[in-house]
C-alpha cells in the first residue's frame, strides 16, 4: 500500500509568492511559493495519486505583514482552502498568547491540530480541551494512518504560551500515544512536529512504532541529487535513521517559507512496515501557475494590508538616526531602538532566579537601511519601518560562548572606517574599542548585562560562559563575515519578523525617544 505525504513547515506567513530568498516578490516571473501556487501543485498530485496526505509541521504564524494584520485568521482560512489534513503546533503559534492561538486558528481550522507533549492545566484546561489533540487517525483510501504531533519543549523561551501550558519532553510524551495507536490496530504512524532536525532524528531512533517523521523548526533542507535552487542540502531526502529496534525510519523536512512542497512516497507492507521511501522537495517556482481562485482570494485579503501599512503605529519625538554615516561608524539611536525592541520582545520571566533569560542584542549596522524623520508629526508607520528593515528577516535567539562574542566584536571593527555593514549596534552590552590597536585586538572592554540578578548591572564578559543573545537571522547564518557566529553557535531558534518586533514595541511605548547613551565607546 502506497502513501504520498505532502508536507510544509515554517511557512511563516508567506501567503503570497516571494523572491528566491523568500523576501517580498519583486519580479513576478521569477517568484516562488505562495498558497496559490502550492494549491496548484497539491491538486495536481491529488488528482494523479490515490492516497495523499497534506501535512504542516508548524510555524505557520509570524513572518510578514499578513500575520501582523490578520493574527492567524489568514492561516486558518487558507489552510482550510488548501484542505490540509493535519498540522502540528510550532513555537510561533503561541506568539500572540494562547488566546491568539485558540480564537483565530484552533476554533476555525477544519483539520486536526496536534501536539502530544503540550499539556494544559488550571483554568485553561477546559477552555482548550479538544481544540488540539495528541494524535489523530485519518482514513486514507481503504487504510487508516495515525498522525501524532509534537512541539519544541523550548517554546516557553521562544514564544508566549503563558503559565498554564506544560511542554513535556517529546520522546517521553510521544511513546504512550504511539502505544495507544497500536492498541487501536493503527499500524502506519507518522510523527509530525516542530522541534528541529536533531530531535526529529532522535524521535525516529527512540519512539517505538513511529514509521515516518515529518519535522520543522530548523528549516532543514534535504535533497537527493542536484538541488534546484540556492539551498544547500543538509542530507539526502528522506534522511534515513535506524531505530533502536532496527527499523529504517525516513525523516523529512522541507526547508521553510513555502518555497518547497515536501513530497515523500512511502510503501507499506500489509503489517504496516515501511518497505521503501523516496521523494524530494518540489521547488514551487514560476513554472507552476498560481491557482486563479486562491489568487483572487489572496488579492481580496490583500486590500486590508495596504491600508494597514500607512496607519500610525506610534510617535517619535526625536530623529531616528538610521543613516549609514552613523550606524556603520558609531552608536546610533535607531540601532538602540531596534535592540531595545528585540530584548523587549523576548521578555520571558520563566525562572525566579533570572529577571529574564536573555539581556543582550547585537545588530549589524548595515542592516539598518533608513532613518525616520520626527518632523512628519512624529508619525511612524509600518511603511516607514519597512524602509528601515526591508529584508524580511527575523530576530533570532542564539546561545554563544563569550569567546565567540569577543570574536564577533573584533570582527565588528576589523576594517573600521570603510562604511561596511558589520559594525555592530548593541543592547545590554557596553563595548570600548581602541582603533589604534591592530585588527583582531581592538576590543579593550566588553561588559554585558547580567540575567541571573535582581538588579541588572554590567559585568565583564567571561570567555567560557554560555550567553543567550538576540540577533538578526542574517548574523546567525554568518552574514557580513560573521562566520564565527555560524560556526560556533551552540543553539539557534528562529524568532519573530524584524519589522513586527519593532512595530509592536513602538505601539506598546506609544511615544519613543531613543538616545545615544554610551553603549559603544572609542578610547
Amino acid at each position: 500500500w502506497e502513501l504520498t505525504i505532502l508536507h510544509t513547515n515554517d511557512v511563516h506567513s508567506r501567503l503570497e509568492q516571494t523572491s528566491e530568498d523568500s523576501s517580498k516578490c519583486v519580479n513576478a516571473s521569477r517568484c516562488m511559493g505562495g498558497v496559490a501556487r502550492l494549491f496548484t501543485k497539491v491538486q495536481q498530485i491529488r488528482r494523479a495519486e490515490p492516497n495523499v496526505l497534506l501535512l504542516d509541521a508548524g510555524d505557520q504564524y509570524q513572518g510578514t505583514i499578513w500575520f501582523t494584520v490578520y493574527k492567524g485568521a489568514e492561516v486558518a482560512h487558507f489552510m482550510n482552502a488548501l484542505r490540509y489534513d493535519a498540522m502540528a503546533l510550532g513555537n510561533h503559534e503561541f506568539d500572540n498568547g494562547v488566546e491568539g492561538l485558540i480564537e483565530p486558528l484552533l476554533k476555525e481550522a477544519k483539520f486536526p491540530i496536534l501536539s502530544a507533549n503540550i499539556k494544559a492545566k488550571g483554568p485553561l484546561a477546559s477552555q482548550i480541551s479538544g481544540l488540539y489533540l495528541p494524535y489523530k487517525v485519518l482514513p486514507v483510501g481503504d487504510e487508516v494512518v495515525g498522525i501524532v504531533g509534537y512541539t519544541s519543549k523550548e517554546t516557553p523561551f521562544l514564544s508566549n504560551p503563558g503559565t498554564n501550558l506544560v511542554f513535556e519532553d517529546e520522546i517521553t510524551a510521544l511513546q504512550p500515544e504511539v502505544d495507544k495507536l497500536k492498541t487501536l490496530n493503527v499500524n502506519k504512524i507518522i510523527a509530525l512536529g516542530h522541534s528541529g532536525f536533531e530531535m526529529d532524528k532522535l524521535i525516529a531512533q527512540k519512539v517505538r512504532g513511529v514509521d515516518v517523521v515529518v519535522g520543522g523548526h530548523s528549516n532543514t533542507f534535504l535533497y537527493t541529487g542536484n538541488p534546484p535552487s540556492k539551498e544547500v542540502p543538509a542530507g539526502k531526502y528522506p534522511f534515513i535513521v535506524t531505530s533502536d529496534d532496527g527499523r529504517k525510519v525516513p525523516v523529512v523536512q522541507a526547508y521553510a517559507f513555502g518555497k518547497y512542497l515536501g513530497y515523500l512516497k512511502i510503501e507499506f507492507d500489509e503489517r504496516g512496515n515501511v518497505i521503501s521511501s523516496h521523494g524530494n522537495p518540489i521547488l514551487l517556482n514560476s513554472s507552476i501557475p498560481e491557482d486563479p481562485s486562491i489568487k483572487a482570494d489572496i488579492n481580496k485579503w490583500r486590500i486590508k494590508l495596504d491600508n494597514y501599512s500607512t496607519q500610525e503605529l506610534g510617535k517619535t519625538i526625536v530623529y531616528l538616526d538610521g543613516s549609514s554615516q552613523s550606524c556603520r561608524f558609531r552608536e546610533c539611536n535607531m540601532g538602540n531602538l531596534i535592540c531595545d525592541a528585540m530584548i523587549n520582545n523576548n521578555l520571558r520571566h520563566t525562572d525566579e532566579m533570572f529577571w529574564n533569560h536573555v539581556s543582550m542584542c547585537i545588530l549589524n549596522g548595515g542592516g539598518i537601511r533608513s532613518p525616520i524623520d520626527e518632523r512628519n508629526n512624529g508619525t511612524i508607520t509600518w511603511e516607514n519601518l519597512a524602509a528601515v528593515l526591508p529584508f524580511g528577516g527575523t530576530f533570532d535567539l542564539v546561545q554563544l560562548k563569550g569567546s565567540t562574542l569577543k570574536k564577533a566584536f573584533e570582527h565588528s571593527v576589523h576594517r573600521y572606517g570603510q562604511s561596511t555593514g558589520e559594525f555592530l549596534q548593541v543592547g545590554g552590552i557596553h563595548v570600548v574599542y581602541d582603533l589604534s590597536r591592530k585588527p583582531g585586538d581592538r576590543v579593550v572592554k566588553l561588559d554585558v548585562l547580567c540575567t541571573k540578578c535582581r538588579v541588572p548591572s554590567y559585568d565583564p564578559l567571561k570567555m567560557d560562559e554560555v550567553y543567550k543573545v538576540i540577533l538578526p537571522n542574517f548574523l546567525a547564518n554568518g552574514g557580513d563575515g560573521f562566520q564565527m557566529i555560524k560556526d560556533e553557535l551552540l543553539r539557534h531558534d528562529s524568532g519573530d519578523q524584524d519589522i513586527n518586533v519593532v512595530s509592536t514595541y513602538i505601539s506598546k511605548m506609544k511615544v519613543i525617544y531613543p538616545a545615544v547613551e554610551g553603549r559603544i565607546k572609542f578610547s
Epitope: 479538544g130 487517525v137 487504510e143 487508516v144 495507536l181 493503527v186
Partner: antibody
Framework: QVQLVQSGAEVKKPGASVKVSCKAS????????IHWVRQAPGQGLEWMGA????????SYNQKFKGRVTMTVDTSTSTVYMELSSLRSEDTAVYYC????????????WGQGTLVTVSS | DIQMTQSPSSLSASVGDRVTITCKAS??????LAWYQQKPGKAPKLLLY???SLETGVPSRFSGSGSGKDYTLTISSLQPEDFATYYC?????????FGGGTKVEIK
Amino acid sequence: QVQLVQSGAEVKKPGASVKVSCKASGYTFTTYNIHWVRQAPGQGLEWMGAIFPGNGHISYNQKFKGRVTMTVDTSTSTVYMELSSLRSEDTAVYYCARGDYDESYFDYWGQGTLVTVSS
Amino acid sequence: DIQMTQSPSSLSASVGDRVTITCKASEGIYNRLAWYQQKPGKAPKLLLYGVISLETGVPSRFSGSGSGKDYTLTISSLQPEDFATYYCQQYWSIPWTFGGGTKVEIK
C-alpha cells in the same frame, strides 16, 4: 441529525445465534466506528467490540472473540452484530453506539435491543 | 484489562445539593475518560469526554476533573432531571471498560 436505529427484541434458545442490526443516518457513515455495548438486567455496561465501516476493521473484547461477528453493509449504512452459542447469561440489552476511530467514547447510542436467552 | 472502580455505588441527595462521584482506574489512562448518564429503560447519554470536555447540550452544572488514575464527576447543583445512574468509561486501552455505576436517588 445523527440517528442509530436498532432491530427489535429477540427471544432465543441456548446454543442458538442472534443477529442484531444497527442502521445509521445523519453523518458520514464510513468515518466513525460503530461499537456494541451490552447491559445485563440490573447490571453495568460491557463493551463487546467495534467495526470501522471505512475499511471493515474490527476490534474485539477478547471475552467475546470467537462468539461475536460484526459485519457492515455500506450500501445501506447498516452494521450487524451476531452472537453465537448463546447462554442464559447473554440475556441483555444490546446497544450500538457511535465513536471516533481514535478516541472511543460514545456520543450517539441506538435505542437498544433486548435479547432474551431462555429454554 | 483496565478495571474502573466507581464510588459510591449509590447515594441519596436533594435538589440543589452538590454531588461528587469518583472513578479510579487500575492503571494510568492519560485523561481518556468519559462520563455517561443513564435513566431507566433508556440508552446511556454522553456527558463529558477527555475528563473535562462537556458534550454539546449538556448543562454546565456537570463538570469533570482528575488525572492519572483518579477522576471525579461533579454536579454543582442537583436538578430533578439529574436523578439517574452515572457511569465512567476509560478509552485508553482495549477493551474499553466502564465503572460499575453510581445510582443517584432522591433523599
